[in-house]
Amino acid sequence: GCMTQLYKNTFFRGGDLAAIYTPDAQYCQKMCTFHPRCLLFSFLAVTPPKETNKRFGCFMKESITGTLPRIHRTGAISGHSLKQCGHQISACHRDIYKGLDMRGSNFNISKTDNIEECQKLCTNNFHCQFFTYATSAFYRPEYRKKCLLKHSASGTPTSIKSADNLVSGFSLKSCALSEIGCPMDIFQHSAFADLNVSQVITPDAFVCRTICTFHPNCLFFTFYTNEWETESQRNVCFLKTSKSGRPSPPIPQENAISGYSLLTCRKTRPEPCHSKIYSGVDFEGEELNVTFVQGADVCQETCTKTIRCQFFIYSLLPQDCKEEGCKCSLRLSTDGSPTRITYGMQGSSGYSLRLCKLVDSPDCTTKINARIVGGTNASLGEWPWQVSLQVKLVSQTHLCGGSIIGRQWVLTAAHCFDGIPYPDVWRIYGGILSLSEITKETPSSRIKELIIHQEYKVSEGNYDIALIKLQTPLNYTEFQKPICLPSKADTNTIYTNCWVTGWGYTKEQGETQNILQKATIPLVPNEECQKKYRDYVINKQMICAGYKEGGTDACKGDSGGPLVCKHSGRWQLVGITSWGEGCGRKDQPGVYTKVSEYMDWILEKTQSSDVRALETSSA
């Protein structure tokens, strides 16, 4: 599972994979997270005078057992990779380091007025990975107010030194802040002849593109398909670069596919994981473990939960199948990619989803089998992400529902805060079934930060989404845990098993219910929903649910709560209860905010906030 704790004055002995320089433990942890085999790291923040060359050393480590012996070392900070940590996985690093010179290959020196301009220059340069800025007080006049753009083979500094009046930092391309823009073009039957920086084996050009995007020096790629004439190059993904940052004109070549890194994209950046399962394909590699499961998706889930697993093969051969299921072979390699890909086997292969930012945070993969108008009483722990948002003025009242999406995050509807946008008056209760069980002693969460979508306007229906950052992180229990968020790619997924929950009215002129209600409701296509609501605009950021004959629906008091659908064995938060004309009326579906349409916004808000949260909690 996800382990976020840092161990001060602790060094892990052995298990060494690689050593790099990073400015702090957080960046070291990030590097470990994205390294295909790294599970543990040790960072030397302080070293004795004789070992100054080891200061800022980031030692990436692996372990078959998932742990290593710890030794006491003053100034060392150790911890775990954030593989399997969902929301917290991000390549973005905004921190600025005063008094540090992050060294590398200086390829450009420009005059800028301030550090922000320097960082922007780096973010908008193809080759820049990190930078150093000399302030106006720097001891060498010729370098004052100069911005040095840098790169290295690893993407990290070649060394780091303390230096007065120097400030260093990283490019913000991985924060989706580059203004370069990114060509999404995929060139079929074309190859780029430029310089190769690395090569990996991939099943298709899309995985190749994602690997290129997260490789420190890849700007574009050429992938050779299984039909390519040279056998040794079949399924090989060549990661490439050039001095100009742009590829030379593509050369026509049968069975070659080329394209660009998406690092400089502002919106369409891929996740650092590959979710597709490839049928009839065999990913070869070192075998880690074998288990018997029912279905390739369960095999993928098993791989995801096994932290060292990088990819898997699920075999359907008769000799590989038993009563409890078929053979699921969990595998790994040095670079995280298969050592060879072959075709025609009976079964499927795919990758671990341990680096997926959201879709598969293991915390939320709970397999739960599953007034709402026309609903029934829920049972304790059945919908552990459901919370009650209550306002405490003279008395305390339930106003809205919400969904836990992280230890410190609740997702709800913006309209819940119409007229009451004051964090102090709200109390949030999780892990409860009946509102009557809430007493003065019942623990509640308070709002640290209320983030209402900037485009939301009262009464106008759109952008009905809000994030609540809690003052203190939640403890996950059997009755209180997060719901998985969809990915942006899930906007067209067809869901067939959807449920809405809440303590809202059970009839139009009703009252709040004591026991949490649940109801299964079919989704209604937007075009059909629009016909039912001729007075309103049903846009693609909305999703509708309801029975043609009515009778089952969300209602007043359910607002902000979840519309969840079970997909591939996992519950996902598909909608946020938003609005309706009456409740449970014939031909009047309930309307929900479509969560997949807001994934960029959710990520932007939770990540920009979480960077600060990590910074303060580990200082």
């Epitope: 309209h415 007229g419 009464s459 106008e460 139009e508 002129q509 001729r534 004309e581």
Partner: antibody
Framework: EVQLLESGGGLVQPGGSLRLSCAAS????????MSWVRQAPGKGLEWVSV????????KYADSVKGRFTISRDNSKNTLYLQMNSLRAEDTAVYYC?????????????????????WGQGTLVTVSS | DIQMTQSPATLSLSPGERATLSCRAS??????LAWYQQKPGQAPRLLIY???NRATGIPARFSGSGSGTDFTLTISSLEPEDFAVYYC???????????FGPGTKVDIK
């Protein structure tokens, strides 16, 4: 206490223009749809125009479409009606009214159904 | 467009009597119907919304009923201040806006 106060009415020649204002107080103006409703002397009520809380959406009766423009300034809690190309049949008392939502509608998308508060009206006379 | 008709055009009654006013829509308006009272020289005042819900501050002698196309406003016992013109109104399909009935005048017999 909710209050709506219209101003800007008067005598104008056919083809002329006039701008009506409605100053609102006693409620959160930016949360509500607002409308203009008129009443010709001795006649019934006729809805003229409506504007959404943010001002992003407007609708007009066919009789005034293309000639009248509704707008609002939420920072000043004021509703406006710009009337151009005025005709004799536009002579009426013009009321500013707050849009009330149905108890049945819930959530973030509230269309106005009724007019729960009205101003006292301002008389517009179009005559040569 | 949905047309609204009101009957009778005039209702002559004495204080203390029961008044029954009718409003008919040319097609169903569900329960989305309101009643207003207007006295000479004054702005209209909302009495009933959603066909049967009394607006804030409206006395209990006023009640509304009906749904679909036929609606009724009842004043159980007329008070002197109730003599006025009463309008029904529906919000027809949103792009079309709002439609008022022609009104029923309740005057003293």
């Amino acid at each position: 206490e909710v209050q709506l106060l219209e101003s800007g009415g008067g005598l104008v020649q056919p083809g002329g223009s006039l701008r009506l204002s409605c100053a609102a107080s006693g409620f959160t103006f930016s949360y509500y749809h607002m409308s203009w409703v008129r009443q010709a002397p001795g006649k019934g009520l006729e809805w003229v125009s409506v504007i959404s809380p943010s001002g992003g959406s407007t609708k007009y009766a066919d009789s005034v479409k293309g000639r009248f423009t509704i707008s609002r300034d939420n920072s000043k809690n004021t509703l406006y009606l710009q009337m151009n190309s005025l005709r004799a049949e536009d002579t009426a008392v013009y009321y500013c009214a707050r849009g009330g939502s149905s108890d049945y509608a819930w959530g973030s998308y509230r269309r106005p159904y009724y007019f729960d508060y009205w101003g006292q009206g301002t008389l517009v006379t179009v005559s040569s | 467009d949905i047309q609204m008709t009101q009957s009778p055009a005039t209702l002559s009654l004495s204080p203390g009597e029961r008044a029954t006013l009718s409003c008919r829509a040319s097609q169903s308006v569900s329960s989305y119907l309101a009643w207003y009272q207007q006295k000479p020289g004054q702005a209209p005042r909302l009495l009933i919304y959603d066909a049967s819900n009394r607006a804030t501050g409206i006395p209990a002698r006023f009640s509304g009923s009906g749904s679909g196309t036929d609606f009724t406003l009842t004043i159980s016992s007329l008070e002197p201040e109730d003599f006025a013109v009463y309008y029904c109104q529906q919000r027809s399909n949103w792009p079309r806006g709002f439609t008022f009935g022609p009104g029923t005048k309740v005057d003293i017999k």
